[in-house]
């Protein structure tokens, strides 16, 4: 079926970066400035996304691909394709509708985004607290007291490079 359609439809020969121009006998015309077509056989080109205001251009628009945006410093991307820029807070804070607020005692946030979360209750997983929590860090759970025999040492592992909530840009 696809082969038959391509024989009958001259538009299927138009590559990405062009569109099938009905006004010019269905010949393939290049996409006008500030527009693109990422697939072949398209009858129109899509308008390029413009990265304005708190958005900044991460990748320029080309005839075959849309522009990509990220956020200016002090903001981070949210949503598919960075559809929103959201204000950063400091570690130990969370963003509410009224702005950045400090985490309450017993909660933490180790990121510039996201919520203040309760410290892990180590005992619920049969473990003990190795390192106390802060506003910026969760507690570190270690083996249960029964597992710690005399002479056993516990080492706190280095902090990971990336925590949940930080998606690669």
């Amino acid at each position: 079926f696809e082969r038959t359609r391509s024989l009958q439809d001259p538009c299927s020969n138009c590559p990405a970066g062009t569109f099938c121009d009905n006004n010019r006998n269905q010949i393939c015309s290049p996409c006008p400035p500030n527009s693109f077509s990422s697939a072949g056989g398209q009858r129109t080109c899509d308008i390029c996304r413009q990265c304005k205001g708190v958005f900044r251009t991460r990748k320029e628009c080309s005839s075959t691909s849309n522009a990509e945006c990220d956020c200016t410093p002090g903001f981070h991307c949210l949503g598919a394709g960075c559809s929103m820029c959201e204000q950063d807070c400091k570690q130990g804070q969370e963003l509410t509708k009224k702005g950045c607020k400090d985490c309450c005692f017993g909660t933490f946030n180790d990121q510039k985004r996201g919520i203040c979360r309760p410290w892990t209750n180590c005992s619920l997983d049969g473990k003990s607290v190795l390192v106390n929590g802060t506003k910026e860090r969760d507690v570190v759970c270690g083996p249960s007291p029964a597992d710690l025999s005399p002479g056993a040492s516990s080492v706190t592992p280095p902090a990971p490079a990336r925590e949940p909530g930080h998606s690669p840009q």
Epitope: D125, D138, P164
Partner: antibody
Framework: QMQLVQSGAEVKKPGASVKVSCKAS????????MHWVRQAPGQGLEWMGW????????NYAQKFQGRVTITRDTSASTAYMELSSLRSEDTAVYYC?????????????WGQGTLVTVSS | SYELTQPPSVSVAPGKTARITCGGN??????VHWYQQKPGQAPVLVIY???DRPSGIPERFSGSNSGNTATLTISRVEAGDEADYYC?????????FGGGTQLTVL
């Protein structure tokens, strides 16, 4: 693409334990909290808890504290939910769900669900 | 603990507008997320942060949130929109879901 694939259906006797797995693919497993939510037949959604796959830190709904344990295997990009001392009221579909990035904690991708039946 | 109240059912004719409410004490100060669940399927996020749509969700779906009520609005309702809808918030130490609303397309 992003996918959460859960283990198959289970039938358990009252008093037993069940362990459900959730294998993540298509994204960095350690980059997003994983949650567990259950749904009894004909009922609504009920949150059970989360795990930080990076640190192993957990938080459980008060209702399930002492009965539920959420763990992870980062090398296998898999999260696990174990529920002990099962009773008939625990018959439900259990879902894993990835936490998204919105303000106030949303769940942007869900596993297909695992039916756990508790029956004597 | 925080509670969210939804009407058990809402009925609407095809092509009309459906409004599903989610009530909670000062819910306007919280971020509300909405999920659609069709029979035998997992929930799908349709609105996050009160009014934002994930990619792939039609523009017919919109949300608002102020005072003590959040609302999911589905305009130009189609037969395929028939499903259960749940609102959800984060409250200090737990994820809270509304009881769910069954949307029936007449």
């Amino acid at each position: 693409q992003m996918q959460l694939v859960q283990s198959g259906a289970e039938v358990k006797k009252p008093g037993a334990s069940v362990k459900v797995s959730c294998k993540a693919s298509g994204y960095t497993f350690t980059g997003y909290y994983m949650h567990w939510v259950r749904q009894a037949p004909g009922q609504g959604l009920e949150w059970m808890g989360w795990i930080n796959p990076n640190s192993g830190g957990t938080n459980y709904a008060q209702k399930f504290q002492g009965r539920v344990t959420i763990t992870r295997d980062t090398s296998a990009s898999t999260a696990y939910m174990e529920l002990s001392s099962l009773r008939s009221e625990d018959t439900a579909v259990y879902y894993c769900a990835r936490e998204g990035e919105a303000v106030g904690l949303d769940l942007d991708y869900w596993g297909q669900g695992t039916l756990v039946t508790v029956s004597s | 603990s925080y509670e969210l109240t939804q009407p058990p059912s809402v009925s609407v004719a095809p092509g009309k507008t459906a409004r599903i409410t989610c009530g909670g004490n000062n819910i306007g100060s919280k971020s509300v997320h909405w999920y659609q669940q069709k029979p035998g399927q997992a929930p799908v996020l349709v609105i996050y942060y009160d009014s934002d749509r994930p990619s792939g969700i039609p523009e017919r779906f919109s949300g608002s949130n102020s005072g003590n009520t959040a609302t999911l609005t589905i305009s130009r309702v189609e037969a395929g929109d028939e499903a259960d809808y749940y609102c959800q918030v984060w409250d200090s130490s737990s994820v809270v879901f509304g009881g769910g609303t069954q949307l029936t397309v007449l």
